[in-house]
């Protein structure tokens, strides 16, 4: 499989980490999360095309079958392969609390 | 979250399980596996509208991203949330051994 | 630059009370959360507490329920706590913190020493 | 609440050492673990936050890891201006509480 940087389609076009400024405002968390008031979203994008970051056996399969049945067999899709943990502050009907999230920012990314 | 029956898109048109056949030669595996001959191979296939069988928060927040940014951010993906285990018999210098892939068939699927 | 200055140094009888400042500059003060952090002479950091200054919304460390109050002023970008019935044991220099991600302290003012003596 | 043990509560070494100071939990706190850095008369400062995620403005020779309940903040290779007290800090859950530190002193 080509590493993360060999992207066969140009710099940066391949499934890679990518980072969103998103207000609470944004994520629709206004009326639960008080803090932090804006989170450096990382996330997966980009596209997957033969072998790149294949995570499994199952992503080269989805690979081969897309190449014969592309109307019918979705390319890999870039996803994170695991993720940062996150605090947040949130409101609750006693006050506030805080909450810790282990599943909510990309840490690295692979195509599936 | 909507149930993974409940799609909003029309009856199977949202993520789910697809069972595709498909020969070894159709999976490029013609030159090193001897069985089986022929593979139900079982994919995630299908659309991921807002909130359909969300992996995790990751899987939210996307879909908030998605739909102030559509251009920037790409709509989740249906994926394996887990797989079903599978024996392959392979050629080998020696003559052939039996190996088991973990990784190789979707069991069932989410949006992420 | 973020910056917290806080108030000089005060010098109380045990059993008074004191009001310690911190003013938030080069940002937007309701941007960042406040936390108030203690720390005794050769000893280790004790949180005492954390502020939201949009609306002033606190959460105590339970050791410091009572001892502490914890208030903000919007106007004047400060932060303030108020230190009730000291004692000796109140004698420390305190921190003010700003956090932009409510997990760690990224921002710290210099402290204010705080002497509890008759 | 959580404690937090910190070890060794001194540490003399030789700029150019390769160091490695301990932060023990109480019980598992994944990745809730942020690192210190305080000198004499100064405030701290935030050096490693989330067990092992680097800081900007912070040297490369600081690093981080460890998750659950063992935690290590490493310098591999000991400069002059980094003599002073380390300091562990949990978020895992309120209330936010510290190590007793780590003097980092020379030998």
């Known amino acids: 499989a080509r590493n993360g940087d060999d992207c066969p389609l140009g710099p940066g076009r391949c499934c890679r980490l990518h980072t969103v400024r998103a207000s609470l405002e944004d994520l629709g968390w206004a009326d639960w999360v008080l803090s932090p008031r804006e989170v450096q979203v990382t996330m997966c994008i980009g596209a997957c095309p033969s072998q790149f970051r294949a995570a499994n056996m199952h992503a080269q399969i989805k690979t081969s079958l897309h190449r014969l049945k592309p109307d019918t067999v979705p390319a890999p899709c870039c996803v994170p392969a695991s993720y940062n943990p996150m605090v947040l502050i949130q409101k609750t009907d006693t006050g506030v609390s805080l909450q810790t999230y282990d599943d909510l920012l990309a840490k690295d990314c692979h195509c599936i | 979250a909507r149930n993974g029956d409940d799609c909003p898109l029309g009856p199977g048109r949202c993520c789910r399980l697809h069972t595709v056949r498909a020969s070894l030669e159709d999976l490029g595996w013609a030159d090193w596996v001897l069985s089986p001959r022929e593979v139900q191979v079982t994919m995630c296939i299908g659309a991921c509208p807002s909130q359909f069988r969300a992996a995790n928060m990751h899987a939210q927040i996307k879909t908030s991203l998605h739909r102030l940014k559509p251009d920037t951010v790409p709509a989740p993906c249906c994926v394996p949330a887990s797989y079903n285990p599978m024996v392959l018999i392979q050629k080998t210098d020696t003559g052939v051994s039996l190996q088991t892939y973990d990784d190789l068939l979707a069991k069932d699927c989410h949006c992420i | 630059q973020v910056q917290l200055q806080q108030s000089g140094p005060e010098l109380v009888k045990p059993g008074a009370s004191v009001k310690l400042s911190c003013k938030a500059s080069?940002?937007?003060?309701?941007?960042?959360?406040i936390n108030w952090v203690k720390q005794r002479p050769g000893q280790g950091l004790e949180w005492i507490g954390w502020?939201?200054?949009?609306?002033?919304?606190?959460k105590y460390n339970e050791k410091f329920e009572g001892k502490a109050t914890l208030t903000v002023d919007t106007s004047s970008s400060t932060a303030y706590m108020e230190l009730h019935s000291l004692t000796s044991e109140d004698s420390a220099v305190y921190f003010c913190?700003?956090?932009?991600?409510?997990?760690?302290?990224?921002?710290w003012g210099q402290g204010t020493t705080l002497t509890v003596s008759s | 609440d959580i404690v937090l043990t910190q070890s060794p509560a001194t540490l003399s070494v030789t700029p150019g050492d390769r160091v490695s100071l301990s932060c023990r939990a109480s019980?598992?706190?994944?990745?809730?673990l942020h690192w210190y850095q305080q000198k004499s008369h100064e405030s701290p400062r935030l050096l490693i936050k989330y067990a092992s995620q680097s800081i900007s403005g912070i040297p490369s020779r600081f690093s981080g890891s460890g998750s659950g309940t063992d935690f290590t903040l490493s310098i591999n290779s000991v400069e002059t201006e980094d003599f002073g007290m380390y300091f562990c800090q949990q978020s895992n859950s309120w209330p936010y509480t510290f190590g007793g530190g780590t003097k980092l002193e020379i030998k």
């Open positions: 913190a700003g956090t932009s991600d409510p997990a760690y302290f990224d921002y």
């Open positions: 502020i939201y200054p949009r609306d002033g919304i606190s």
């Open positions: 019980q598992s706190i994944s990745y809730y």
């Open positions: 080069g940002y937007t003060f309701t941007s960042y959360d």
